[in-house]
């Protein structure tokens, strides 16, 4: 539903996008994800902030919590207890890292319309959640875990050793949050709330990253984060399970680590409850090509958890690392022992497999030169998953249903033909037992969210269709978008090209490459966006291209694992190759080509600028990695191994931006970084700047004081305005 091309007579009423449009979020879209509370009911926050319950079966809806109650504690979020008696209200949200935040929590009793008084929760809380049944509460406060049997009861303290930056219970440390789980929590209720499993992370031996936070005080504060860089000491993780009915009886019981994992440094990667007395843990060697899935059972007689070797399943990669970005998680079937899991098949494509006894005997469920991406739900008779199979476009996502009750299993694409032009990139959200589901379409047209019957797949209603956005775009000259591929030396390079509204192939246009290019990423996706690059094409007449080269995801292991142990080589080569192909198309002004990227993209854009090809006139790196020795162990070592002489130190040294300082002499380089970046530390850009100064190479730079990796708030406006000026100057475009 992209507004169609208008006739010339109307064109004078149309206007181009402005930078202001982008910075104000004028053309942002809404999605609708139901907050499912049963097979047929969901909660949703209305426009006026009432919490409303919808019953699909009866077609009725009613308010369960008024905006007045929400406002009385300045609540920005809520959570209904499964027994429907209480709601927690979350306020004083204070962001920490990517997912983590602290907040104040109030418990509201729906039966009597009052807040629960007595034994109130401490503040601020790091994480809080209801049990899956009833209204028990688990929460983390000052790195320790507490349990309440009822909201008004006094808490039972489960752990006592929690200490800031040293021991984390029930919440991850920095590296587990960002690179492994990746969540703000590290505790998991069993299906009926009998047991609570949690992780303990010991960061005592991890080196600390320290940076200044300037604030408004006379003296800056120092932020200290235990942050393991490549090759450094890692967190030590242990998993415990406690009986929540009688927590004091035997206390937390540790779950044993598989022997083949415990023999050297390792990670815990995820925990999945199967039943109240069976749990599945996933472990990973520090050298991340071996993963072990371990199924453990509760021994009533010993009150311990037993993880027999016969229930250990090994997943190993011989050509790269285990999994995609993360090792996939199992989805258990109703027999509570067999499961479905996505991993590479013999042809090197990630597909769904059914594991009953051993991984060697796994039954492959999907197959083809495409990839299964996510398993949403397994019911008694159906398995719902997403893939990029349809019409062989890797940047699409459709939802499929495989009937597992019948033989042979039949496959149906639920979304492929629903709104074919408008919708080619879906995700889904399922109610209990998959009685109903919501489809959220992200594009390429204007996003739309719909509700469907889980048996018939029939559309029941539109939940959100972004009518206001559609109307607002009616008089906007949006750029055109194309998704195509280049075939180069047996490699397929998919690209997205964003073209000015009045694009004319016979004319010459400046080209901007937008790159990310990190391992297992994908930039060329069939999604809707009106963003900075849309403005650059619409108003400034630039052509923008995004290219998925080697190392990117969902096109098979050959492409994905090509960058294994060699980051910074093929990703850059493939961007350069694509630029040369674009020049051959005849409409690119080869004297006006730029590249820009953020984070991993900043690393790639820097290396591309310093490639010595003479292709790029200028470029921008925002918060770039400059040496893999400066980045997090979990991420970096997955793709690069260890920075030791007997492993991969040589390539760590060869792949730095600093090593190419001399090559920046003939390009215009804008380097940008936030000083309070907890993720890609300011150190990275500081070292690039130092190397450029030492090489007497001129460059431009901008820092954002006290800003993290996201450069949010007012910094965003300044950033995009600054980058726009830089590009317009580079391309000799008048202001």
């Amino acid at each position: 539903l992209r507004p169609s091309r208008v006739h010339n007579s109307e064109e004078n009423t149309m206007r181009a996008l402005t930078l202001k449009d982008i910075l104000n979020g004028t053309f942002s879209y809404k999605t609708f994800f139901p907050n499912w509370i049963s097979g047929q009911e969901y909660l949703h926050q209305s426009a006026d902030n009432n919490i409303v319950l919808y019953n699909i079966e009866t077609g009725q809806s009613y308010t369960i919590l008024s905006n007045r109650t929400m406002k009385s504690v300045n609540a920005s979020n809520y959570g209904l207890s499964p027994d429907r008696q209480f709601v927690y209200l979350e306020s004083d949200y204070s962001k920490l890292w990517r997912y983590s935040y602290t907040a104040t929590y109030y418990i509201y009793d729906l039966s009597n319309g009052e807040f629960v008084r007595g034994n109130e929760l401490p503040r601020p809380i790091q994480y809080l959640c209801w049990s899956p049944v009833g209204s028990k509460l688990a929460y983390v406060y000052q790195n320790n875990i507490y349990l309440k049997q009822r909201p008004g009861d006094p808490p039972f303290q489960i752990t006592f050793n929690g200490r800031e930056n040293k021991i984390f219970n029930g919440i991850p440390d920095w590296v587990y949050e960002e690179e492994m789980l990746p969540t703000k929590y590290a505790l998991w209720w069993s299906p009926n709330g009998k047991f609570l499993a949690y992780a303990e992370f010991n960061d005592k031996d991890i080196p600390v990253i320290a940076y200044s936070y300037y604030g408004d005080e006379q003296y800056p504060r120092t932020i200290n984060i235990p942050y393991p860089k490549a090759g450094a000491k890692n967190p030590v993780v242990r998993i415990f399970i406690i009986d929540t009915t009688y927590p004091a009886y035997v206390g937390p019981q540790e779950v044993p680590v598989p022997a083949m994992i415990a023999s050297s440094d390792y990670y815990f990667s995820w925990l999945t409850w199967v039943t109240d007395e069976r749990v599945c843990l996933q472990w990973l060697k520090r050298v991340q090509n071996v993963s072990v899935l371990s199924i453990c059972d509760f021994r009533e007689d010993w009150q311990t958890w037993d993880c027999p070797k016969t229930q250990e399943h090994i997943e190993e990669s011989r050509t790269g690392w285990a999994g995609g970005f993360f090792v996939s998680r199992p989805v258990f079937s109703y027999d509570a022992i067999s499961y479905y899991k996505i991993f590479s098949d013999k042809d090197g494509y990630k597909h769904i497999h059914y594991i009953k006894d051993t991984v060697e005997n796994a039954i492959q469920i999907t197959s083809g030169k495409w990839e299964a991406i996510n398993i949403f739900r397994v019911t008694q008779d159906s398995l719902f998953y997403s893939s990029n199979e349809f019409e062989e476009y890797p940047g699409r996502r459709n939802i499929y249903r495989i009937s597992i009750g019948s033989y042979p299993p039949s496959k149906k694409c639920v979304t492929c033909h629903l709104r074919k032009e408008r919708c080619q990139y879906y995700t889904a959200s399922f109610s209990d037992y998959a009685k109903y589901y919501a489809l959220v379409c992200y594009g390429p047209g204007i996003p739309i969210s719909t509700l469907h019957d889980g048996r018939t797949d029939q559309e029941i209603k539109i939940l959100e269709e972004n009518k206001e956005l559609e109307n607002a775009l009616k008089n906007i000259q949006l750029p055109k978008e194309e998704i195509k591929k280049l075939e180069v030396d047996e490699i397929t390079l998919w690209y997205k090209m964003i073209l000015p509204p009045q694009f004319d192939r016979s004319k010459k246009y400046p080209l901007l490459i937008q790159v990310y290019g990190g391992p297992c990423s994908q930039s060329v996706r069939s999604v809707f966006a009106v963003n900075w690059i849309s403005y650059l094409a619409s108003k400034e007449g630039m052509v923008i291209a995004l290219v998925d080269g080697r190392g990117t995801a969902f096109q098979g292991d050959k492409l994905l694992y090509a960058v294994y142990r060699k980051l910074g080589v093929y990703e850059v080569e493939d961007q350069i190759t694509a630029v040369r192909k674009f020049i051959e198309m005849g409409f690119i002004d080869e004297k006006r080509i730029a590249i820009w990227g953020w984070s991993y993209g900043g690393y790639v854009s820097s290396l591309a600028l310093a490639s010595g090809t003479g292709l790029f006139k200028c470029g921008i790196a925002v918060a770039p990695v400059s040496s893999w020795e400066y980045y997090a162990s979990v991420y970096t070592e997955r793709f690069m191994g260890l920075p030791t002489k007997d492993d991969n130190l040589e390539h760590y040294k060869n792949s730095t931006v600093m090593a190419r300082a001399e090559y920046f002499r003939n390009v215009d380089y804008l380097l940008i970084h936030g000083t309070a970046d907890d993720n890609v530390h300011f150190q990275n850009s500081a070292q690039i700047a130092k190397a450029l100064v030492n090489a007497q190479v001129d460059f431009q730079a901008m820092w954002y004081s006290d800003q993290n990796h996201g450069l949010s708030g007012l910094s965003t406006n300044h950033l995009y305005t600054h980058m726009t000026h830089f590009l317009k100057q580079c391309f000799s475009l008048s202001d």
């Epitope: 049963s38 097979g39 047929q40 009911e41 009432n50 319950l53 019953n55 079966e57 009866t58 077609g59 009725q60 009613y62 308010t63 369960i64 919590l65 008024s66 209904l80 429907r84 008696q85 709601v87 729906l110 039966s111």
Partner: nanobody, 115 residues
Framework: QVQLQESGGGLVRAGGSLRLSCAAS????????MGWYRQAPGKRREWVAT???????NYADSVKARFTISRDNAKNTVYLQMNSLKPEDTAVYYC?????????WGQGTQVTVSS
């Protein structure tokens, strides 16, 4: 405005039984998840029992095995069968959706259990 009319309360001896009814007004469908709640003198209103749209039931510990919640879709009515009543069950009993509809409580029906 949703109308929920409770009835069936009364005075009963300890160990006796009562059956409460809750009739939902025309527009409100009793197939919604429904609950019984009660308020004893000088105490806050508390939850007693729930029946979900698909018929699953849930009870407060204090009434488990003595009270039974059920519904008749044709009559748009929800029931609470109360057996082995105790003096501490004395309260005004209300029915509502589960979770309750904000600001929509009926008059309730008084249940008094004498010893």
């Amino acid at each position: 405005q949703v109308q929920l009319q409770e009835s069936g309360g009364g005075l009963v001896r300890a160990g006796g039984s009562l059956r409460l009814s809750c009739a939902a007004s025309g527009t409100f469908d009793s197939r919604n998840a429904m609950g019984w709640y009660r308020q004893a003198p000088g105490k806050r209103r508390e939850w007693v029992a729930t029946i979900t749209t698909d018929g699953r039931t849930n009870y407060a510990d204090s009434v488990k095995a003595r009270f039974t919640i059920s519904r008749d879709n044709a009559k748009n009515t929800v029931y609470l069968q109360m057996n082995s009543l105790k003096p501490e069950d004395t309260a005004v009993y209300y029915c509502n959706a589960a979770p309750p509809i904000f600001g929509s409580w009926g008059q309730g029906t008084q249940v008094t259990v004498s010893s």
